[in-house]
């Protein structure tokens, strides 16, 4: 028989349940998992289902971004009677099934984390034998990736009236605070811009007018560490040289 899951209820522990007479689907996922960039993280997901002793074909799926429609990052399939869930998709080879789907465990390990992995993930299981049924976590688990600051760009650019300005862009989570130091500056927050639209981990700080030759240093800091980079301004007859 075929059923699709539309109605779900969820408590504060992100236990998602579908109930009808003598049948019960549920998925248990934590609201959030935190890990540092470069490390590995486990996304726990366990489930219950109403089909006792089901040993038919099974597919385990993890999506990113949004339930039902988000891109798949992991998929494996187990043949009838087999406990071996053969991996069919593992994005960039970084996703590994830690749980055994035959034992109602879809837990996933994500390796070599990057800031771009900071999103919500949704587990899903599909039965495709005599029973056709499927269920997906609707609220999912948020993977919160933290990272020490890294300065991704520092540059000196011409600005009107033969002046120069400096830009420093850094990434990190929490978003780093940026400060400039340099000739006649002391320490300045120097017009820090808000994180860029669509780039929540990037922060840019601008020095609008470089009035002296010399070394300008951008420092990025958050609770996990700090990073700095420098540019040099030398004006020769109106020209500039900048190096990091």
């Amino acid at each position: 028989f075929v059923r699709t899951k539309i109605d779900t209820t969820e408590n504060l522990l992100n236990t998602e349940v579908h109930s009808s007479p003598a049948q019960r689907w549920s998925m248990q996922v934590p609201p959030e998992v935190s890990a540092e960039a470069g490390d590995a993280a486990v996304l726990p997901c366990t489930f219950t289902h109403p089909h006792r002793h089901y040993d038919g074909p099974l597919t385990a799926i993890w999506r990113a971004g949004e339930p039902y429609a988000g891109p798949q990052v992991f998929r494996c399939a187990a043949a009838r009677g087999s406990e071996l869930c053969q991996t069919a998709l593992s994005l960039h080879g970084r996703f590994r099934l830690l749980g055994n789907p035959r034992r109602n465990d879809l837990s996933l390990r994500v390796e070599r984390l990057a800031l771009a992995d900071d999103r919500r993930y949704f587990c899903r299981v599909e039965f495709a034998g005599d029973v056709h049924d499927r269920y997906e976590s609707r609220h999912g688990v948020r993977l919160h990736v933290t990272a020490a600051p890294r300065i991704v760009n520092i540059s000196v650019l011409p600005s009107p009236a033969h002046a120069f300005r400096a830009l420093c862009t850094a990434e990190g989570e929490p978003p780093p605070a940026l400060a400039w130091s340099g000739p006649a500056l002391g320490n300045s927050l120097a017009a820090v811009r808000s994180p860029r639209e669509g780039h929540g981990h990037l922060v840019t700080a601008e020095l609008p007018a470089l009035t002296h030759d010399g070394r300008y240093t951008c420092t990025a800091a958050n609770s996990l560490g700090r990073s700095e980079a420098s540019v040099y301004l030398f004006r020769f007859h109106g020209a500039s040289g900048a190096s990091t």
Partner: antibody, heavy 120, light 108 residues
């Protein structure tokens, strides 16, 4: 780089106890299942025990069940094997190993091994 | 519980191809992993999931698995390949890991 450094081996009398340790570094210890594997002198590899990434699941070879206990302290990045009621046939080099694949996985990194000798 | 059977020894001349087998009931339905162990050293993973090679393992090492036999193939054998080789699977009924008895590869 991934490192597994073992300690705790030695000579022990039959019936006594010993605890082996395996200190992990270079990877997120709390995200990986860990194993103990042993090798008797001149013999092949024998799987001993596994513990899941969070310590919630443990499985043992029949030959050590009820006598050995596998545990982990994720805050210390350390794996343990508590060996009680030791027998002469437990004499072996004991290796800790990381499970690198899925739940049906393989051992992608191994410790250097530590010799346990059970003798009166 | 799974039982894995390996030949105790295999001999091969340098430059030739060595094949080490691992027999087990319907082993083709399992993922098979292979380890190399040299005297006095810890084992090293050389093939995982039947045929995948970890980084750092030469392309000369390959694996296959079907039916009741998994095979580790070492082409263009070198003296440094002389070692013991073990196959390993996961036994789903017990959640145990099972090793074969090991095969000593001798390079003539």
């Amino acid at each position: 780089q991934v490192q597994l450094v073992q300690s705790g081996g030695g000579v022990v009398q039959p019936g006594r106890s010993l605890r082996l340790s395996c200190a992990a570094s270079g990877f997120t210890f709390s995200s990986y299942a860990m194993h103990w594997v042993r090798q008797a002198p001149g013999k092949g590899l024998e799987w001993v025990a596994v513990i899941s990434y969070d310590g919630s699941n443990k499985y043992y070879a029949d030959s050590v069940k009820g006598r050995f206990t596998i545990s982990r302290d994720n805050s210390k990045n350390t794996l343990y094997l508590q060996m009680n009621s030791l027998r002469a046939e437990d004499t072996a080099v004991y290796y800790c190993a990381r499970e690198g694949g899925s739940y049906y996985g393989y051992f992608d990194y191994w410790g250097q091994g530590t010799l346990v000798t059970v003798s009166s | 519980q799974s039982v894995l059977t390996q030949p105790p020894s295999v001999s091969v001349a340098p430059g030739k191809t060595a094949r080490i087998t691992c027999g087990g009931n319907n082993i083709g339905s399992k993922s098979v992993h292979w380890y190399q162990q040299k005297p006095g050293q810890a084992p090293v993973l050389v093939i995982y999931d039947d045929s995948d090679r970890p980084s750092g393992i030469p392309e000369r090492f390959s694996g296959s698995n079907s039916g009741n036999t998994a095979t580790l193939t070492i082409s263009r054998v070198e003296a440094g390949d002389e070692a013991d080789y073990y196959c390993q699977v996961w036994d789903s009924s017990s959640d145990h890991r099972v090793f074969g008895g090991g095969t000593k590869l001798t390079v003539l």
